[in-house]
Interface confidence: low
Amino acid sequence: SSPTSSASSFSSSAPFLASAVSAQPPLPDQCPALCECSEAARTVKCVNRNLTEVPTDLPAYVRNLFLTGNQLAVLPAGAFARRPPLAELAALNLSGSRLDEVRAGAFEHLPSLRQLDLSHNPLADLSPFAFSGSNASVSAPSPLVELILNHIVPPEDERQNRSFEGMVVAALLAGRALQGLRRLELASNHFLYLPRDVLAQLPSLRHLDLSNNSLVSLTYVSFRNLTHLESLHLEDNALKVLHNGTLAELQGLPHIRVFLDNNPWVCDCHMADMVTWLKETEVVQGKDRLTCAYPEKMRNRVLLELNSADLDCDPILPPSLQTS
């Protein structure tokens, strides 16, 4: 059920009006069929209606547009381009609408769009120019401040013959349009790695959520340029250890809070630097909850309670005795 507010009096369009108005130009600020509208609250909700396309007759006053729980499949170029433009649209939520393709320029002509949520869509084909709108090497800056892309990974059999991480990163970096992005959420996307150049080109980031992925290592990732970063969520990944370079970079960020819970930390000799760092640092939230997963003899030991004597490595076997 749609939330209501004292600030809003939602008017609903009856489904039978759809065919009646489609042949003629839309009335000014009418409410699209299958949607609920509140001019006072500048809000349009077309939620759980199985819509297959973005309504053409969105009212010009809309600031908050909820198109969740539909069956949109494709967002074409200019999906929200209107005449006059939707100049006030600031928050656009398209989560859970079965989108599998977002084309170049899908969000063009939305000069005030600050918050975009594409979560829970199986995006097999995200154009590199979905957010930048053009293939210029430097595009006009996007007004986006928050981009929510949680659980957009398609099923294995629907992925193109390319890296999903690479596809997403290409869209984030195209034309350097997202230089003003402050919040980026990429949770639950089966990311195995983070391409090394992505963070360097998003210098305004305050909040980065990479939780519930499959990140094994941050060795080639640099956080050095993210001087404004306030929260870094790395919970529920496959991290084994953080190495010195990463530790130093994180420690050098003035406002950072790092979340590292539920990673399979390997407590051997390579963990010594991280344990020392954990004991000294204030940047890791809930650091007392971090426990070893491997080797077996160390399982469930608290990292903060380890000392150098606990952290040993088995001697390397000669090649003739090694097994795969």
């Epitope: 059920s1 939330p3 209501t4 507010s5 004292s6 600030a7 809003s8 609250a41 500048r42 809000t43 600031r63 908050n64 006030e88 600031a90 928050a91 939520n93 005030s112 600050r114 918050q115 401040v145 928050e146 929510i148 949680n150 402050r182 919040r183 959420e185 949770a187 305050r206 909040h207 959520d209 929260s231």
Partner: antibody, heavy 121, light 107 residues
């Protein structure tokens, strides 16, 4: 009827901790961003922190960043503010408020009655 | 962060007067501005949102205008219950700041 009821305020020493709660009723809690606003004695309203409906996004005023943590339990219709390393200047009445609209185009349409936090030795 | 500056800080007026309070933003905030009324011992109350929209249940003597950096709250004919402190708040920025308040007192 929308209702917001704060609790958890009280007297605490500098450096201490306190956890405020805000019990919400009368609306679909998980659909709305929520926030904490405070008013110190003789001072104006100060926006403290906000959190999205899902709880995935948090926002903090510079004055409390790193010391306060906002959270919510949508199954219990409850908003929280964990306040650590409290200072005398955190003394205030703390209000929870409901946001209407997307975070960047929002307004606070319902407010609780507030709970007093006093930080003093 | 975006700074909000209200003027005047305090103001004396009589019942029936027309009163205007202004709010200036340190950068353009489009029309992402709200006005609240605060009375001692009471929770703040939303009066105007999105610069000019009157909140449900608020008397029509209250009105808001402005866009960009300069905004105005007007009370067309002051009533005894209107003596309070008024705050503007921007929600354009990443952090949602209030003005310092304008205290409206009886002359």
């Amino acid at each position: 009827e929308v209702q917001l009821l704060e609790s958890g305020g009280g007297l605490v020493q500098p450096g201490g901790s306190l956890r405020l709660s805000c019990a919400a009723s009368g609306f679909t809690f998980s659909s709305y961003a929520m926030s904490w606003v405070r008013e110190a004695p003789g001072k104006g309203l100060e926006w403290v922190s906000a959190i999205s409906g899902s709880g995935g996004s948090e926002y903090y005023a510079d004055s409390v960043k790193g010391r306060f943590t906002i959270s919510r339990d949508n199954s219990k219709n409850t908003l929280y503010l964990q306040m650590n390393s409290l200072r005398a200047e955190d003394t205030a009445v703390y209000y929870c408020a409901r946001y209407y609209g997307g975070y960047y185009s929002a307004w606070m349409d319902y407010w609780g009655q507030g709970t007093l936090v006093t930080v003093s030795s | 962060d975006i700074q909000m500056t209200q003027s005047p800080s305090s103001l004396s007026a009589s019942v029936g007067d027309r009163v205007t309070i202004t709010c200036r933003a340190s950068q353009s905030i489009s029309s992402y501005l709200n006005w609240y009324q605060r009375k001692p011992g009471k929770a703040p109350k939303l009066l105007i949102y999105a610069a000019s929209s009157l909140q449900s249940g608020v008397p029509s003597r209250f009105s808001g205008s402005g866009s960009g950096t300069d905004f105005t709250l007007t009370i067309s004919s002051l009533q005894p219950e209107d003596f309070a402190t008024y705050y503007c708040q921007q929600t354009y920025g990443y952090l949602h700041t209030f003005g310092q308040g304008t205290k409206l007192e009886i002359k």
